[in-house]
């Protein structure tokens, strides 16, 4: 797995460099989380042939994963810091459910799945911290999540590949929707 | 235990019709995906026609888009499949199949996880 942001060897042989503004340190976080991300698809996509054959196979998605929409104010037209800022934040606490269910999906990476899941804790963290209206983030109903984790793993093997693939390509869009909007705030 | 049963095949002329029926025991579909596949003899089992649990949604194959439509009664936990336009080459064993979550509907067959024994279809020119 790769060594968390401020643990790579750079940062300890460095040690008169400035530390990280709060936005130095989420955009990091981000990035972080984005490769994981990457190297988790790799091996989805090497274990089966969901990536290139899952617009073609699905037919309909009621995963309900978050996306970010026009009304969010995360992009160009319509940018709103405080409104996208709620977003993102719901967004994250709603994808912890379908972080959760991807632990036990990979075999050469599971490390990795447990380090996406425990830096985007993280990064929700370091994005409350950021928020000033912290009322207005409506947290995920944990009896409502648990019957939704319970479902996805009650999917047969082929649903499951396909479910796996489709929240890490939706968590990627998510991620990189909020690193641009961050990097305007 | 899920069974699933289909009924209503037969011979039938090209330009006539037929009404599939499937219908299932052992549990409630009504939130689930159900779907209609077939297998005409040395072909691989294809994509026919799907319907959603949640939202009523139907999808099509493009070899039968506008002659076949897929129906359910949740009431019954019986699905349909009305084929008007009939060709010879709709002939094959005609398989009704369930899904179980209902979180994901797909026009694959691994996306399934009940079937049914399958009714034959003939439509001879």
């Known amino acids: 797995a790769p060594v968390p942001p401020g643990e790579d060897s750079k940062d300890v042989a460095a040690p008169h460099r400035q530390p990280l503004t709060s936005s130095e340190r989420i955009d990091k976080q981000i990035r972080y989380i984005l490769d994981g991300i990457s190297a988790l698809r790799k091996e989805t996509c090497n274990k089966s042939n969901m990536c290139e054959s899952s617009k073609e196979a699905l037919a309909e998605n009621n995963l309900n994963l978050p996306k970010m929409a026009e009304k969010d104010g995360c992009f160009q037209s319509g940018f709103n810091e405080e409104t996208c800022l709620v977003k993102i934040i719901t967004g994250l606490l709603e994808f912890e459910v379908y972080l959760e269910y991807l632990q036990n999906r990979f075999e050469s990476s599971e490390e990795q799945a447990r380090a996406v899941q425990m830096s985007t804790k993280v990064l929700i963290q370091f994005l409350q911290k950021k928020a000033k209206n912290l009322d207005a983030i409506t947290t995920p109903d944990p009896t409502t999540n648990a019957s939704l984790l319970t479902k996805l793993q009650a999917q047969n093997q082929w649903l499951q590949d396909m479910t796996t693939h489709l929240i890490l390509r939706s968590f990627k869009e998510f991620l990189q929707s909020s690193l641009r909007a961050l990097r305007q705030m | 235990d899920v069974q699933l049963v289909e009924s209503g095949g037969g011979l039938v002329q090209a330009g006539g019709s037929l009404r599939l029926s499937c219908a299932a025991s052992?549990?409630?579909?009504?939130?689930?995906?159900m779907g209609w596949f077939r297998q005409a003899p040395g072909k691989e089992r294809e994509f026919v026609a799907a319907?959603?649990?949640?939202?009523?949604?139907?999808y099509y194959a493009d070899s039968v888009k506008g002659r076949f439509t897929i129906s359910r009664d949740n009431a019954k936990n019986t699905v349909y499949l009305q084929m008007n336009s009939l060709k010879p080459e709709d002939t094959a064993v005609y398989y009704c199949a369930g899904e179980r979550v209902g979180l994901l509907l797909t026009v694959v067959a691994e996306g399934y996880d009940y079937w049914g024994q399958g009714t034959q279809v003939t439509v001879s020119s």
């Open positions: 319907i959603s649990g949640r939202s009523g949604n139907t």
């Open positions: 052992g549990r409630t579909f009504s939130s689930s995906p």
